[in-house]
């Protein structure tokens, strides 16, 4: 990657981070009456998430994420869940590249939507701070 492509990657990661934080803030909103129900849904967590290729694991969970977000009141988000997830999907596909043979491996234990989002927020922050 060139310095310009790395800069583009950094910007994409920052957009991904903001989108994930917006979702987390939306579902954690004290006015969200569906939070208790949303927390009953389980998400698969990556066995490891340190590099861009590990975004394969996030991509595979975007559909379940959209389905859970559809439970929330739409006013908690600036965009409809379908549009929000579509935006994330575009970023993820660009970031992880076209290495189609890379298969995700998941951790043994599942997580709530809050734990899931926090994991990918941590991932985004760490890549932003270490990508050179």
């Amino acid at each position: 990657p060139t310095s310009s492509s790395t800069k583009k990657t950094q910007l994409q990661l920052e957009h991904l981070l903001l989108d994930l934080q917006m979702i987390l803030n939306g579902i954690n909103n004290y006015k969200n009456p569906k939070l208790t129900r949303m927390l009953t849904f389980k998400f698969y967590m990556p066995k490891k998430a340190t590099e861009l290729k590990h975004l394969q694991c996030l991509e595979e969970e975007l559909k379940p994420l959209e389905e859970v977000l559809n439970l929330a009141q739409s006013k908690n988000f600036h965009l409809r869940p379908r549009d929000l997830i579509s935006n994330i999907n575009v970023i993820v596909l660009e970031l992880k590249g076209s290495e189609t043979t890379f298969m995700c491996e998941y951790a043994d234990e599942t997580a709530t939507i809050v734990e899931f989002l926090n994991r990918w927020i941590t991932f985004s922050q760490s890549i932003i701070s270490t990508l050179t």
Partner: antibody, heavy 117, light 107 residues
Framework: EVQLVESGGGLVQPGGSLRLSCAAS????????LAWVRQAPGKGLEWVAA???????YSPDTVRGRFTISRDNAKNSLYLQMNSLRAEDTAVYYC???????????WGQGTTVTVSS | DIVMTQSQKFMSTSVGDRVSVTCKAS??????VGWYQQKPGQSPKALIY???FRYSGVPSRFSGSGSGTDFTLTISSLQPEDFATYYC?????????FGGGTKLEIK
């Protein structure tokens, strides 16, 4: 059998440069993330840099802007270009393979870098 | 950055002892922890990954446990070749970080 062999270490003056190499064999080199880890005399281990299979590079604040990790998949080789060296960079530098889903599973024997005037 | 703390720098032990080396992470790292053995003048050797899984060829007397922030490497019956320094490492996020190491010394 997986093998990692480092070379290129030596004595260099503060402010100087050095290029370390790591020759890999026994695995599909291009499919793995590779890392450099260093160990100062009598101290613990410190992660220095990593490069993934797409050649994206990662490093901590301590070396960013001074050290550059790169790879040549055709030669099954990993490199660490070290510039603006300081006394505190004195260490044994290890090349390690980062398994896709687990820890650093194979390590080279190390090469010694001494920064001193 | 995540700080990995091995509170015991040295442990005085004897052959045949059951030894537990502990490591604490400054934040939740799930089970993304590896353990390494290093003997003087040698490079680190990977023992454990995912907190509790032994690498191929690692003797069964070595075991790992823990998740979240607290991790333990246990040697069920210490052998003469086990006197070495042991490091934990988190690979939950970059930058990877290591514990300061625990050196097993002969009592």
């Amino acid at each position: 059998e997986v093998q990692l062999v480092e070379s290129g270490g030596g004595l260099v003056q503060p402010g100087g440069s050095l290029r370390l190499s790591c020759a890999a064999s026994g695995f599909t080199f291009s499919s793995y993330t590779l890392a450099w880890v260093r160990q100062a005399p009598g101290k613990g281990l410190e992660w220095v840099a990593a490069i993934d299979s797409s050649s994206y590079t990662y490093s901590p604040d301590t070396v960013r802007g001074r050290f550059t990790i790169s790879r040549d998949n055709a030669k099954n080789s990993l490199y660490l270009q070290m510039n603006s060296l300081r006394a505190e960079d004195t260490a044994v530098y290890y090349c390690a393979r980062d398994s896709n889903w687990d820890a650093l599973d194979y390590w080279g024997q190390g090469t010694t870098v001494t920064v001193s005037s | 950055d995540i700080v990995m703390t091995q509170s015991q720098k040295f442990m005085s032990t004897s052959v045949g002892d059951r030894v537990s080396v502990t490591c604490k992470a400054s934040q939740n790292v799930g089970t993304n922890v590896g353990w390494y053995q290093q003997k003087p003048g040698q490079s680190p050797k990977a023992l454990i990954y995912s907190a509790s899984f032994r690498y191929s060829g690692v003797p069964s007397r070595f075991s790992g446990s823990g998740s979240g922030t607290d991790f333990t490497l246990t040697i069920s019956s210490l052998q003469p070749e086990d006197f070495a320094t042991y490091y934990c490492q988190q690979y939950y996020t970059y930058p990877y970080t290591f514990g300061g190491g625990t050196k097993l010394e002969i009592k």
